[in-house]
């Protein structure tokens, strides 16, 4: 008789999840010599230990502490790029501007990027059929708690000028319910962070509006100012040109507004 299995609303664990995490860990430590001390087998064991045999709606930040400890990494605190709803461009940017880092450029962010995982209470099985959806099922699921934990730590580590890339094509350019709006904004440390600089990325080629005047950006400014952090905002009218100018800053066309 097949055992009854909880059906969740979200997609199941990414196929070959253990192998993917382990492969990413090995690749990351090969490419980043400063992380050579990391034992990827131990990292996987700690990752697995955070959610295996636990109810997937009952995961806590505490469950991830052994993994956080193994993945401890020092990134230059003044070179942090946060993003919201515009991951691809943020990653393209840090691939070119190698001295800046998104969360996914760190070991733990790199391991979990675009993956889904969950287990089942009281069994050592990984659930490849379905996992809890943040809205429809529960917020304390393995994936959401992981990103909340690593995002909080990443924001806490930031100093000086912190940059955030925001998607100007969305109805809410700043969304209080995003990871940036609900976690990272509130964990920037005013005693370390001087300024949050928002880069609002325009979608349409003919869009010449000043999106820094958007009501949601004003809301972000208000939240940040109340936390005794300065706020500045820039429109990036031509993201393609922006990337090109990061690659070739001496290009004559890069002196004009992008």
């Amino acid at each position: 008789v097949p055992r009854w299995r909880q059906q969740w609303s979200g997609p199941g664990t990414t196929k070959r999840f253990p192998e993917t995490v382990l492969a990413r860990c090995v690749k990351y430590t090969e490419i980043h010599p400063e992380m050579r001390h990391v034992d990827c087998q131990s990292v996987w064991d700690a990752f697995k230990g955070a959610f295996i045999s636990k109810h997937p709606c009952n995961i806590t930040e505490e469950d991830y502490q052994p993994l956080m400890k193994l993945g401890t990494q020092t990134v230059p605190c003044n070179k942090i790029l946060l993003w919201s709803r515009i991951k691809d461009l943020a990653h393209q940017f840090t691939q070119v501007q190698r001295d800046m880092f998104t969360l996914e450029d760190t070991l733990l962010g790199y391991l979990a990027d675009d993956l889904t995982w969950c287990g089942e209470f009281n069994t050592s099985k990984i659930n490849y059929q379905s996992c809890p959806d943040w809205r429809k099922d529960c917020s304390n699921n393995p994936v959401s708690v992981f990103w909340k934990t690593v995002s909080r730590r990443f924001a806490e580590a930031a100093c000086d000028v912190v940059h955030v890339m925001l998607n100007g094509s969305r109805s809410k350019i700043f969304d209080k319910n995003s990871t940036f709006g609900s976690v990272e904004v509130h964990n920037l440390q005013p005693e370390k962070v001087q300024t949050l600089e928002a880069w609002v990325i325009h979608g349409g080629r003919e869009d010449s509006r000043d999106l820094c005047q958007d009501p949601t950006i004003k809301e972000l400014e208000s939240i940040i100012s109340k936390r005794n952090i300065q706020f500045s905002c820039k429109n990036i009218y031509r993201p393609d040109k922006f990337l090109q100018c990061v690659k070739n800053p001496e290009d004559s066309s890069c002196t004009s507004e992008i």
Partner: antibody, heavy 121, light 107 residues
Framework: QVQLVQSGAEVKKPGSSVKVSCKAS????????INWVRQAPGQGLEWMGR????????NYAQKFQGRVTITADESTSTAYMELSSLRSEDTAVYYC??????????????WGQGTLVTVSS | EIVMTQSPATLSVSPGERATLSCRAS??????LAWYQQKPGQAPRLLIY???TRATGIPARFSGSGSGTEFTLTISSLQSEDFAVYYC?????????FGQGTKVEIK
């Protein structure tokens, strides 16, 4: 004792492909990175890439990206290196090599005997 | 990619003498450096890893030193079986790269 046994010498025409095999014996194959290193006649050594069989994870040196494919067959403990669009400069001895430690692949303690690939019209 | 430069290209030494081989990296590779020995018609053989740790079964006359960009392989008293080509390899940054080799020949 770990042994890596490679396939025999090959003569290929420019523009064609070659596939060299490397069969491992002696201990558990799947957890260990198998690397491919080549050596042109009278020249130094050049790292091409590697695969970790059970992770099915291959990585290549930029120079060979798009032209080399490294695969592994866990059932036969054999790794393969396929190089396409061959040119005369690809004439070399191709070695497979492995490290002592599982997963990691920094330096190589075990080497195959080498496979001479000659590219000539 | 990191360029590894070995010197001299050829070293002529008498048996029993000391041989000092040099390897320079175009940028720091920390201690992530290995040395290999290769004889004609044979595959390379690992001698040293971590810049100074001898691999299993390697005689004590082989020693490695250095870190950052400057490395040395020393063979304290050359035996007849030591005449070969020696390569350094960095494994700090992808792709792993080798030096062009130093040939140690009988004087």
């Amino acid at each position: 004792q770990v042994q890596l046994v490679q396939s025999g010498a090959e003569v290929k025409k420019p523009g064609s492909s070659v596939k060299v095999s490397c069969k491992a014996s002696g201990d558990y194959f799947n957890n260990y990175a198998i690397n491919w290193v080549r050596q042109a006649p009278g020249q130094g050594l050049e790292w091409m890439g590697r695969i970790i069989p059970f992770l099915d994870d291959a990585n290549y040196a930029q120079k060979f990206q798009g032209r080399v494919t490294i695969t592994a067959d866990e059932s036969t403990s054999t790794a393969y290196m396929e190089l396409s669009s061959l040119r005369s400069e690809d004439t070399a001895v191709y070695y497979c090599a492995r490290a002592t430690s599982p997963l990691y692949s920094y330096y190589f303690d075990y080497w195959g005997q080498g496979t001479l690939v000659t590219v000539s019209s | 990619e990191i360029v590894m430069t070995q010197s001299p290209a050829t070293l002529s030494v008498s048996p029993g003498e000391r041989a000092t081989l040099s390897c320079r990296a175009s940028q720091s590779v920390s201690s992530n450096l290995a040395w290999y020995q290769q004889k004609p018609g044979q595959a390379p053989r690992l001698l040293i890893y971590g810049a100074s740790t001898r691999a299993t079964g390697i005689p004590a006359r082989f020693s490695g030193s250095g870190s950052g960009t400057e490395f040395t392989l020393t063979i304290s008293s050359l035996q007849s079986e030591d005449f070969a080509v020696y390569y350094c390899q960095q494994y700090n940054n992808w792709p792993w790269t080798f030096g062009q080799g130093t040939k140690v020949e009988i004087k």
